[in-house]
Every structure is written in structure tokens, then in C-alpha cells.
């Protein structure tokens, strides 16, 4: 999906209002220095691409994020403010229903959510110095 035409201001507002709080709740008990930033993004559409990938694409060591509250709210926000996003996600959602839900929050999931927090922070940032 091409995130170029999303309403970035509305997505930013949703993130600050709810998604950020859910991410921080998920990460409670860990320090911001516990994990290195290994994923970055270079503009707002790119950030949303990476956020979608980390939130909804299961990895071998962290398969459960899509069921979390922050993921559900992320999905709703993207569906609301990115034209045509919902239609592209129908197949992905059907595939997701076939997977078993993991109840354990693994260290790898914490690491992945730490990366997500970093990506969201980059998404909402504006360069103070354009140079």
C-alpha cells in the first residue's frame, strides 16, 4: 500500500491521543535504553510503511502483535485516514485469523514494540533545522 495520500495530521493526532499510550503500556517495566534502534524511516509515508510491517507482519519470534490493542487502533487509524487502505488489508486479515494467538509477551516482542515506538516518534517529528 502507498501511504503517500494519507492524512498525516489526523494520524498524528490519533497516535498522540491513544496509540502512544497503548504502546507505552505494553512496554511498561522496560527502559528506553534496553533496545537499540535498528529500524528508521525517512519520511512520513516511509514511516507508515515500516510501522505497518512491524505491527502486522508476524516474525518467527514475535507472532502476536496484531492482536494487541495498539495494533487494533493502528489498523483503525490507517483505515480511517488512508484512502483505500481497508480494501488492501482484507486478505491480510483473513490470513491472520488462521494463526494461533500467543499469550506470552516475549523479549523479542518488546524489542519489536520498542522499534515501533521509535518509528512513531520519527513519524510525528518535524525537523526544527532544515539546514
Amino acid at each position: 500500500y502507498d501511504f503517500t495520500n494519507c492524512d498525516f495530521q489526523k494520524i498524528e493526532a490519533d497516535y498522540l491521543r491513544t496509540i502512544s499510550k497503548d504502546l507505552i503500556t505494553y512496554m511498561s517495566g522496560t527502559k528506553s535504553t534496553d533496545f537499540n534502534n535498528t529500524v528508521s524511516c525517512s519520511n512520513r509515508p516511509h514511516c507508515l510503511t515500516e510501522i505497518q510491517s512491524l505491527t502486522f507482519n508476524p516474525t518467527p519470534r514475535c507472532a502476536s502483535l496484531a492482536k494487541e490493542m495498539f495494533a487494533r487502533k493502528t489498523k483503525a487509524t490507517l483505515a480511517l485516514w488512508c484512502p483505500g487502505y481497508s480494501e488492501t488489508q482484507i486478505n491480510a486479515t483473513q490470513a491472520m485469523k488462521k494463526r494461533r494467538k500467543r499469550k506470552v509477551t516475549t523479549n523479542k516482542c518488546l524489542e519489536q514494540v520498542s522499534q515501533l515506538l521509535g518509528l512513531w516518534r520519527r513519524f510525528i517529528r518535524t525537523l526544527l533545522k532544515k539546514q
Epitope: 537499540n36 535498528t38 529500524v39 528508521s40 524511516c41 525517512s42 519520511n43 516511509h46 515500516e50 520519527r122 517529528r125 525537523l127 533545522k129 532544515k130 539546514q131
Partner: antibody, heavy 122, light 108 residues
Framework: QMQLVESGGGVVQPGRSLRLSCAAS????????MHWVRQAPGKGLEWVAV????????HYADSVKGRFTITRDNSKNTLNLQMNSLRAEDTAVYYC???????????????WGQGTMVTVSS | SYVLTQPPSVSVAPGQTARITCGGN??????VHWYQQKPGQAPVLVVY???DRPSWIPERFSGSNSGNTATLTISRGEAGDEADYYC???????????FGGGTKLTVL
């Protein structure tokens, strides 16, 4: 562990070519701008070239423009520097380094390789 | 093209504060980054975006930037701080990374 490992350095005669490579691991290579920086013996750091995260934007130092070519392969997590028409003044340790990028602004060079030595001599 | 000027050398007594300057025309409008390089080693980022510090760098390292001068401050200097220090900016006008000439810090 985040790592950059350069290779391909060596001794080469003036006017000849050399190709440097940099293998990235431990981070999502495709999301970072990548640079080459060099350091002549006993001298300071000199920036050589940058390629954007997607490969769409490329910029060179004036001293190497038209002779050096920077490329990346995001599927293999590798950065390359093709150096043609080498001169004695190109003798240096060449470092591969990464930086986060926002639009067309490249941020701090936060991870560096250990460097590979290039000697141009007849 | 944009030029960054650093003093070639700075000395500090152990336990004292060292200040390394980086001069440039209206440098305060740029984000300045600082690197430490010990002999035979690759540079290491010590301060970024004027005054932020990577998590692995001690709090003794700090930075500031305004007007025509950026400053790297190293408090409570130690022998292990002896190194070359480089300032750096990205110039959007020339599309170049620009480094200062480097400053050799000696802990007396």
C-alpha cells in the same frame, strides 16, 4: 549486534580501478542512508558520498565526482563504492557509515565500520 | 561550500573541563554532530543534534550550539578521553556532509 564490515581495499596503481564493499548486519539496512567517509594517513575525516535509503538520491564530494560511484543492494544488505581513475590523493582508510535520513536531511553518522585501506601508488 | 573551523589542539588537566569549539557561518541553524576518534580506530558518535547523547556515551560529554559557534564540553577529563574530535553538519544547499578539521585533545 549492529555491524558494518568493509572489504576490497588494497594497493593499486594510479589510473586503475578498485571496488569497495560494505556488509551490513544487525539492523534494517533498507531504512538508512549510507555514506562513505575517508581519512588520509595523518589527516582528518573527509566525506566521500551518500546514497539515500532507497537509492533514489546520490551525492558526491567534489573531489571524487565523475570518478567514484556509490551503489547499494537492499536485498543483500550491501553498500558499494566503485572507484575509477584513482589518484595518489585517494590514498586513505575508507569507512562505511550509516545515518538516519529525514526527507533530504541526513542525520548523525551513528554506526561506523572499521575501515579498509586503499593505497594508490606506482 | 560550507566550512567548519576547529582549533588543532586543546589541553585539559585531569578532572577539569575541556571545551572544543566548532565555528561556522550561522552554525546555530545547523544540527551539529560530534565524533571521537582514538588512534587506529573508527570514529564514534558522542553528541548528535547539537546536544543529545547516545545511550552508551557518559554524561560528562555535552554539546551546545548557537550563533556562529558549536561547543563540545567534556567535564571531569580523563586519560581515556584523549583522542581527535570532529564536528559535522549536513549542508542541504550543497547536499554535502561537512566535517571540521578535527581537534586533538590532550589530557595533561
Amino acid at each position: 549486534q549492529m555491524q558494518l564490515v568493509e572489504s576490497g581495499g588494497g594497493v593499486v596503481q594510479p589510473g586503475r580501478s578498485l571496488r569497495l564493499s560494505c556488509a551490513a548486519s544487525g539492523f534494517t539496512f533498507r531504512t538508512y542512508g549510507m555514506h562513505w567517509v575517508r581519512q588520509a594517513p595523518g589527516k582528518g575525516l573527509e566525506w566521500v558520498a551518500v546514497i539515500s535509503y532507497s537509492g533514489s538520491y546520490i551525492h558526491y564530494a567534489d573531489s571524487v565526482k565523475g570518478r567514484f560511484t556509490i551503489t547499494r543492494d537492499n536485498s543483500k544488505n550491501t553498500l558499494n563504492l566503485q572507484m575509477n581513475s584513482l589518484r595518489a590523493e585517494d590514498t586513505a582508510v575508507y569507512y562505511c557509515t550509516r545515518s538516519p535520513q529525514w526527507e533530504e536531511v541526513y542525520e548523525a553518522l551513528d554506526i561506523w565500520g572499521q575501515g579498509t585501506m586503499v593505497t594508490v601508488s606506482s | 561550500s560550507y566550512v567548519l573551523t576547529q582549533p588543532p589542539s586543546v589541553s585539559v588537566a585531569p578532572g577539569q573541563t575541556a571545551r572544543i569549539t566548532c565555528g561556522g557561518n550561522n552554525i546555530g541553524s545547523f544540527s551539529v554532530h560530534w565524533y571521537q576518534q582514538k588512534p587506529g580506530q573508527a570514529p564514534v558518535l558522542v553528541v548528535y543534534d547539537d546536544s543529545d547523547r547516545p545511550s552508551w556515551i557518559p554524561e560528562r560529554f555535552s554539546g551546545s550550539n548557537s550563533g556562529n559557534t558549536a561547543t563540545l564540553t567534556i567535564s571531569r577529563g580523563e586519560a581515556g578521553d584523549e583522542a581527535d574530535y570532529y564536528c559535522q553538519v549536513w549542508s542541504s544547499t550543497s547536499r554535502h556532509v561537512v566535517f571540521g578539521g578535527g581537534t586533538k585533545l590532550t589530557v595533561l
